[in-house]
Interface confidence: low
């Protein structure tokens, strides 16, 4: 069956270059026109570029024209997107997408590859407790959590009590701070009565920096 | 370029409902329109092409219609698997142009948020920064307003919000708002409060703490 497997994404500094690849299988690559489409975090789909099946014609969105170049190697069944002079606004998941016969809608998609354009360097998070108190208690339920701050790049994973605690957990999507670093919170609601007896530990893993932190969250002692 | 405008941007519905999404083109595109479904973290999936032709394997409850400049995608009886974001795309011109998307979410019952406030930890204060977190837990609908007040003075530009995806079990959302200050600024003030306005609350709810007190 038709498969499009993408590679080449990653973190790159503004002004630098990156090359994305889209390896095709399950069809005669040289007969098909393939496009690039991207999706910025939390945004909609944006068409980026196309190269006709025979390489004669290339077309680009205004936003990337002159910076991005599409190419293909039929002997390798691979489509490329060379991205130069990258900007923070180019941060997105990039998809390659194959048309159906000659009609330019997209019947087959790659899995997507994330490109992050940032001047930030890889950095592990600081993990701070969000301690339960009378201010975080409501009707027999207490809230507590962890603030996972100042890391780069995405993602981090957060679990509670090594995965044993899942009910009542909310791990929020990361926000990009003005510093260029990410921050997120993970919270859990528990019975107030358990605060004195049960141990609550958030387990934070940031693979890009090889950082693992286990933070015990307990009521603030006054 | 041909511009595509989708409406509504969000649509709340229940399983079994008939829902309709509209897509308008800035100029005639004949019937050269496709519809896609996308779920979080996944690539889009083709549903419909040539305005009304169903892609192979797509359930017949998806119905496309329209020509020229006005198009609709109708789901005749919404199923649990249909909660997703939908995009239209014209392919009349060389610049492929998508609509901005329509998110179909589960219609819940109004639920007021539980509100919690967390002071910065001593650990964080040692690093020179103070983050105050306000948590709004398990509410519906998604629209909620959070205002930060420091010694009763309204804050702006120094907080960031993040909202969870809709919970698959109870259809609610949760929100965190983080007020970030330097340690020096934090220590200049005493009362930190977050004020929450939501449809499920008869009046705004305020949670606060006095710096330095338990």
């Amino acid at each position: 069956q038709v498969q499009l497997v993408q590679s080449g994404g990653g973190v790159v500094q503004p002004g630098r270059s990156l090359r994305l690849s889209c390896a095709a299988s399950g069809f005669t690559f040289s007969r098909y026109t393939i496009h690039w489409v991207r999706q910025a975090p939390g945004k909609g789909l944006e068409w980026v570029a196309v190269m006709s099946y025979n390489g004669n014609n290339k077309h680009y969105a205004d936003s990337v024209n002159g910076r991005f170049t599409i190419s293909r190697n039929d002997s390798k069944n691979t489509l490329y997107l060379n991205m130069n002079s990258l900007r923070p606004e180019d941060t997105a998941v990039y998809y390659c997408a194959r048309i159906r016969d000659t009609a330019m809608f997209f019947a087959h998609w790659g899995q997507g590859t994330l490109v992050t354009v940032s001047s930030a360097s890889t950095k592990g998070p600081s993990v701070f407790p969000l301690a339960p108190s009378s201010k975080s208690t409501s009707g027999g339920t207490a809230a507590l959590g962890c603030l996972v701050k100042d890391y780069f790049p995405e993602p981090v994973t957060v679990s509670w009590n090594s995965g044993a605690l899942t009910s009542g957990v909310h791990t929020f999507p990361a926000v990009l701070q003005s510093s260029g670093l990410y921050s997120l919170s993970s919270v859990v609601t528990v019975p107030s009565s358990s605060l004195g007896t049960q141990t609550y530990i958030c387990n934070v893993n940031h693979k890009p920096s090889n950082t693992k932190v286990d933070k015990k969250v307990e009521p603030k002692s006054c | 370029d041909i511009q595509m405008t989708q409406s509504p941007s969000t649509l709340s519905a229940s399983v079994g409902d008939r829902v309709t999404i509209t897509c308008r083109a800035s100029q005639s595109i004949n019937t050269w329109l496709a519809w896609y479904q996308q779920k979080p973290g996944k690539a889009p999936k083709l549903l419909m092409y040539k305005a009304s032709s169903l892609e192979s394997g797509v359930p017949s409850r998806f119905i496309g219609s329209g020509s020229g400049t006005e198009f609709t995608l109708t789901i005749s009886s919404l199923q649990p698997d249909d909660f997703a974001t939908y995009y239209c795309q014209q392919y009349n011109s060389d610049s492929k142009m998508f609509g901005q998307g329509t998110k179909v979410e589960v219609k819940g019952t109004v639920a007021a948020p539980s509100v919690f406030i967390f002071p910065p930890s001593d650990e964080q204060l040692k690093s020179g920064t103070a983050s105050v977190v306000c948590l709004l837990n398990n509410f519906y609908p998604r629209e909620a307003k959070v205002q930060w007040k420091v010694d009763n003075a309204l804050q702006s530009g120094n907080s960031q919000e993040s909202v969870t995806e809709q919970d698959s079990k109870d259809s609610t959302y949760s929100l965190s708002s983080t007020l970030t200050l330097s340690k020096a600024d934090y220590e200049k003030h005493k009362v930190y409060a977050c004020e929450v306005t939501h449809q499920g609350l008869s009046s705004p709810v305020t949670k606060s703490f006095n710096r330095g007190e338990c």
Partner: nanobody
Framework: QVQLQESGGGLVQAGGSLRLSCAAS????????VSWFRQAPGKEREFVAV????????FYSDSAEGRFTVSRDDAKNTVYLQMNSLKPEDTAIYYC??????????????WGQGTQVTVSS
């Protein structure tokens, strides 16, 4: 205004051959992709083949691949569809259409009136 006129249809026995012609007037078609479609009774119109712009080659649907050949004679402003090893399921009205965009988008600006092909078993 471009006008397209198909011809060459008719009744043929299974296994036989036909050559359809699509003659264009009003515009030189060498710069454009010309496609063949067909519509069987009670079915949706389906793509058969395209003669892409001169030098760009051809493309076929799975059902046409290996049996049908599309070609063009730009001097005569005509595109042909040579159909061999015809089957009863090839019975349909065959249409030609011009796609004037660069990338063969499937947005066909001009259509012919169609020519009937009937394949008997």
């Amino acid at each position: 205004q471009v006008q397209l006129q198909e011809s060459g249809g008719g009744l043929v026995q299974a296994g036989g051959s036909l050559r359809l012609s699509c003659a264009a007037s009003g515009r030189t078609i060498s710069r454009y992709a010309v496609s063949w479609f067909r519509q069987a009774p009670g079915k949706e119109r389906e793509f058969v083949a395209v003669a892409r712009r001169t030098g760009d080659g051809a493309f076929y649907s799975d059902s046409a691949e290996g049996r049908f050949t599309v070609s063009r004679d730009d001097a005569k402003n005509t595109v042909y569809l040579q159909m061999n090893s015809l089957k009863p399921e090839d019975t349909a009205i065959y249409y030609c259409a011009i796609d004037s965009s660069t990338f063969y988008t499937g947005s066909y600006d001009y259509w012919g009136q169609g020519t009937q092909v009937t394949v008997s078993s």
